[in-house]
């Protein structure tokens, strides 16, 4: 089935090369050999901030291939994975593992997707099947969301799902993911 073996239930994540060739040794693994940035929102009062807008979180850059059945994108797409705890922007490190990690003693802040973008992708298929054009939804930026004690466990679980790569079989969110084709693609199919 062509690329079927390449694709499993979790989308394969390929570290982006050339960003941080020597990541901090304590975090050297497949999921963290990526560029990390803070959200860049400067705090007014970095040590006693109450405003979510004054918090920032890590935006990890990942590249992955888009698949549709046995077909795979000709090129990988790059998107963000929102990761980790949120803290005052000024205290967050610019790269993973640099500096101390700040943990709030009060409300919990989670790093979740903020904005999304749609991208057209051309997929190549094995066995002479016509190429497929699809659209995918990619995370474009992350934000900190304040969780109070009133948030129940299911909502916490939800944040965990959003913070990770979309997995196969997860429940669809209100936002959606799409596909596209050109006329040549259809004509080739007939």
């Amino acid at each position: 089935q062509g690329w079927q073996a390449f694709k499993n239930d979790a989308t394969e994540i390929i570290p982006e090369l050339g960003e941080y060739p020597e990541p901090p040794p304590e975090l050297e693994n497949n999921k963290t050999m990526n560029r990390a940035e803070n959200g860049g929102r400067p705090p007014h009062h970095p040590f006693e901030t109450k405003d979510v807008s004054e918090y920032s979180c890590r935006e990890l850059h990942f590249t992955r291939y888009v698949t549709d059945g046995p077909c795979r994108s000709a090129k990988p797409v790059t998107e963000l994975v929102c990761s980790g705890q949120c803290g005052p922007a000024r205290l967050l490190p610019n790269a993973i593992g640099r500096g101390k990690w700040w943990r709030p003693s009060g409300p919990d802040f989670r790093c979740i997707p903020d904005r999304y973008r749609a991208q057209r992708v051309q997929l190549l298929c094995p066995g002479g099947e016509a190429p497929r054009a699809r659209k995918v939804r990619l995370v474009a930026s992350c934000k900190c969301k304040r969780l109070t004690r009133f948030h129940n466990q299911s909502e916490l679980k939800d944040f965990g799902t959003e913070a990770a790569r979309p997995q196969k079989g997860r429940k669809p969110r209100p936002r959606a993911r799409s596909a596209k084709a050109n006329q040549a693609e259809l004509e080739n199919a007939y």
């Epitope: 698949t67 549709d68 939804r137 799409s178 596909a179 259809l186």
Partner: antibody, heavy 122, light 107 residues
């Protein structure tokens, strides 16, 4: 809330044309493919094609090639399907639908318009 | 062109019954490309299951899907009054194709 609202029922004579509209709200139409599917009375669903509102690129089933034109007006978030040289067997409910983006590596139509009945009769 | 054939075309059942609808595909497709829709009279179709076995948002857990290659099934574990409708399988590779539909009626 995601919605696709279609224009009202039409009665046309054979040989005429019909243009059905589909107004999208609750999402950015440019991010999604819009599909058109029709259903003749008492029959099953028949895919006609789809359009990318972002660039106007469309895909038509060969059966409708030359008779159908799909367009969009992104300023009003509206998709259109025009079918020309109507015949009595074009009498059907015409649906617009959105292809969802949020299902991992799955591609399914997740929201549909309410349908527009087009009756072709002399 | 990939053809989808549903069986049975008509199905009579009672509330509480377990029912299974089969969708046969003319050539093997990936399970990620097979979806199921429910349609009630005078209404637009509604996405029920995507990618063979994944429930769409708001769909009750009594619905389930399975299969691979050329044989796929939709199962309703315990029929409820609101489940009487027409069900369509659909594949999306380079073209969209629907099965002819299975009308589920009250016995």
């Amino acid at each position: 809330e995601v919605q696709l609202v279609q224009s009202g029922a039409e009665v046309k004579k054979p040989g005429a044309s019909v243009k059905v509209s589909c107004k999208a709200s609750g999402f950015n139409i440019k991010d999604y493919y819009i599909h058109w599917v029709r259903q003749a009375p008492g029959q099953g669903l028949e895919w006609m094609g789809r359009i990318d509102p972002d660039n106007g690129e469309s895909t038509y089933v060969p059966k409708f090639q030359g008779r159908v034109t799909m367009t969009t007006d992104t300023s009003t978030s509206t998709a259109y399907m025009e079918l020309r040289s109507l015949r009595s067997d074009d009498t059907a409910v015409y649906y617009c639908a959105r292809e969802g983006l949020d299902y991992g590596d799955y591609y399914a139509v997740d929201y549909w318009g309410q349908g527009t009945l087009v009756t072709v009769s002399s | 062109d990939i053809q989808l054939t549903q069986s049975p075309s008509f199905l009579s059942a009672s509330v509480g019954d377990r029912v299974t609808i089969t969708c046969s595909v003319s050539s093997s497709i990936s399970s990620s490309n097979l979806h199921w829709y429910q349609q009630k009279p005078g209404k637009a179709p509604k996405l029920l299951i995507y990618g063979t076995s994944n429930l769409a948002s708001g769909v009750p857990s009594r619905f389930s899907g399975s299969g691979s290659g050329t044989e796929f099934t939709l199962t309703i574990s315990s029929l409820q009054p609101e489940d009487f409708a027409t069900y369509y399988c659909q594949q999306w590779t380079t073209t969209y194709t629907f099965g002819q539909g299975t009308k589920l009626e009250i016995k």
